[in-house]
Amino acid sequence: CDLPQTHSLGNRRALILLAQMRRISPFSCLKDRHDFEFPQEEFDDKQFQKAQAISVLHEMIQQTFNLFSTKDSSAALDETLLDEFYIELDQQLNDLESCVMQEVGVIESPLMYEDSILAVRKYFQRITLYLTEKKYSSCAWEVVRAEIMRSFSLSINLQKRLKSKE
């Protein structure tokens, strides 16, 4: 499956929007840093089948969408930027869904890569728990925004590697 050229442009736009969501100087938030245990192994090449990679990427973007579409995120972040961010993520999801269906068929994919998908879900659960424990403070959002930017960048790198293998 060939992801459209607009897909990588959408990735870049999503990253720019994440960067623009900054509300306070991050320098005041050093003490709030947290290890979310990003599931790096799910984004390494290993013996990754393309279909598995696409499923993991889809889950990553879906969970990012979920995280940023809560009422707490709407209260903490710029709504105009959030709306643009949702549009970009929605397009990413559509692109990847088309790919998943082409690669493995819609029935098999969620079951075949359950462990990888579960690892991504648990990662986002840790992020949500952190935000809850920190009472959705400005610094907590700043830390999460930085973390999502990092994980998003790693997702983009995985997509680039997939493309180069075609």
Partner: antibody, heavy 121, light 107 residues
Amino acid sequence: EVQLVQSGAEVKKPGESLKISCKGSGYSFTSYWIGWVRQMPGKGLEWMGIIDPSDSDTAYSPSFQGQVTISADKSISTAYLQWSSLKASDTAMYYCARHPGLNWAPDFDYWGQGTLVTVSS
Amino acid sequence: DIQMTQSPSSLSASVGDRVTITCRASQSIGSFLNWYQQKPGKAPKLLIYFASSLQSGVPSRFSGSGSGTDFTLTISSLQPEDFATYYCQQSYSIPITFGQGTKVEIK
């Protein structure tokens, strides 16, 4: 390979201006902050300030606030440290180092080789 | 500002010795404490981050412990290349601050 390459040694007179540089390569320059550290002859390490190259947001140590300016040009992956009017007491080795920002990763894991600044009349 | 106090300021030791350097913060800094090694004419090198995590490529004879205000860097068996100055540094808050350094010399 991650590298921070600093500009060469400088010999200046008191009152002169100076801008030294730190060029990052082998990683995403805007994904890390760049910190500056001073080491006067025979002395310890002193943190001067830091910059987020993604938007040029800066923070300074109170000891250096107003004495130096930290800037960055992300288009050429370079951070700068500058003085508008040097003093003899600015004679020191200056290091840049990368910092992971708010990400859970090692602080100051890569350092530049240092720029020796000598201020003498 | 958070003050970082290292002790001792210098120490003499022999190859094979176990060496311990301590660092005390003026207020609790959690585990946001790093250790660096610096040799004359060279840039500092990160050894330990987040109080106890060994930086990639650093020999396992180096270890770090502590949290809150009291921290320790231990070299289990001193090697000839370990004679250097060691600095602790807090990254809990801005301004970031370093300890004054501990010089490890040959006995």
